[in-house]
């Protein structure tokens, strides 16, 4: 006899990395005949649906119209069905951006190199922080952790061309609160002439798509925005 | 305290070909990538070519590109820049740069001038 249903898909939208002051729905996906969803930041319950009707809804979306620092974290969602509840979603990372300070994103030997070059990214805020992340736009999830006083060192090692795309990084006062994100650098990685062909550029989107591109996660690139279940997952941890 | 010193600079016509050189006073076989900037008067330095080490890789700037030629002697410790088919927009002041690790450029040059004029 099942004890448990099973566990509902959780995602942000438009995307789990909000700017401070903006507004942010986290979406909870879990069966038609739910008859209760319960939200829980940082392990406590933070708010409650009651779809009506019930059977004919299986998504219900919580609406955070103010994102601050206080609001980022871990959030996670389950269900009910009648008596039933469900296994706990994934945790969903939900981070503040635009705090404080813009970091400086530098890279070398330069944003044009051969494939086969040892390349270093570079990301220097001066304010209170030693976390940095390093991010690649476009549907992948690349994304890197560094540690430094004012400045973290990213080294690629050598590059193929599956590296060439647009990098930002962000200084992070805590897992959760990021800065500004620096100015894009875009990385083009030439293939060596004797022995490399140029492969595709990692899909992208436009600059100013920077804040609602998403990451996707071990499940591919799912069309379903219910299926972005462990967006950012691996992001923190 | 690792030196890196240039030399062959001097005013040659346009068309005409020059090889800079770039002694280093440490071994060089084992630092991963040496390089050529240059800079105009009243403007920004800017890379010319670089390679690696180990790897032999070559960058060329696309404006010295099937014109100009790096290589390393490391058995001499010296650097190489060939320039051939030399225009009045090459002149400036060009400097050796040594990246031992491949993070940064460490080690510079003082520079020496090249003045392409007819």
């Known amino acids: 006899q099942q004890q448990t249903l099973p566990k509902p898909f959780i995602w942000a939208e438009p995307h789990f990395m909000v700017p401070k002051e903006k507004q942010v729905t986290i979406c909870c996906q879990g069966n038609y005949g739910a008859v209760e969803y319960q939200l829980h930041f940082e392990g406590s319950l933070f708010a409650v649906d009651r779809p009506k009707p019930p059977e004919r809804i299986n998504k219900v979306q919580f609406y955070i119209p103010d994102m601050n620092s206080r609001m980022a974290g871990q959030y996670s969602c389950i269900y009910r069905v009648g008596e039933l509840w469900s296994e706990p979603s994934n945790l969903l990372d939900l981070v503040v951006t635009e705090m404080y300070d813009t970091p400086t994103l530098s890279v070398h030997p330069g944003p044009e190199v051969i494939s086969g070059e040892k390349v270093t990214f570079y990301c220097r805020l001066d304010t209170a922080t030693s976390m940095f992340l390093l991010l690649k736009e476009g549907r992948s999830s690349h994304v890197q952790r560094g540690y430094g006083k004012v400045q973290a060192e990213f080294p690629l090692g050598p590059v193929t061309t599956a590296h060439r795309g647009t990098y930002r990084c962000f200084g992070s006062y805590n897992n959760h609160a990021w800065s500004f994100p620096s100015e894009p650098v875009k990385l083009l990685v030439t293939g060596d002439i004797e022995n490399t062909s140029l492969a595709p550029e990692d899909p992208t989107f436009p600059a100013d798509t920077w804040g609602t591109y998403l990451l996707t996660t071990e499940t591919g690139l799912q069309k379903d925005h219910a299926l972005w279940d462990h967006t950012a997952q691996n992001l923190l941890r | 305290q690792v030196q890196l010193v240039e030399s062959g600079g001097g005013v040659v016509q346009p068309g005409r070909s020059l090889r800079l050189s770039c002694a280093a006073s440490?071994?060089?076989?084992?630092?991963?990538?040496m390089g050529w900037f240059r800079q105009a008067p009243g403007k920004g330095r800017e890379v010319v070519a670089r390679i690696s080490g180990d790897t032999n890789i070559k960058y060329y700037a696309g404006s010295v590109k099937g014109r100009f030629t790096i290589s390393r002697d490391n058995s001499k410790n010296t650097l190489y820049l060939q320039m051939s088919s030399l225009r009045a927009e090459d002149t400036a002041v060009y400097y050796c740069?040594?990246?031992?690790?491949?993070?940064?450029?460490?080690?510079w040059g003082q520079g020496t001038l090249v003045t392409v004029s007819s």
């Open positions: 740069a040594a990246d031992r690790t491949g993070a940064t450029w460490d080690y």
């Open positions: 440490g071994r060089t076989e084992s630092w991963y990538r």
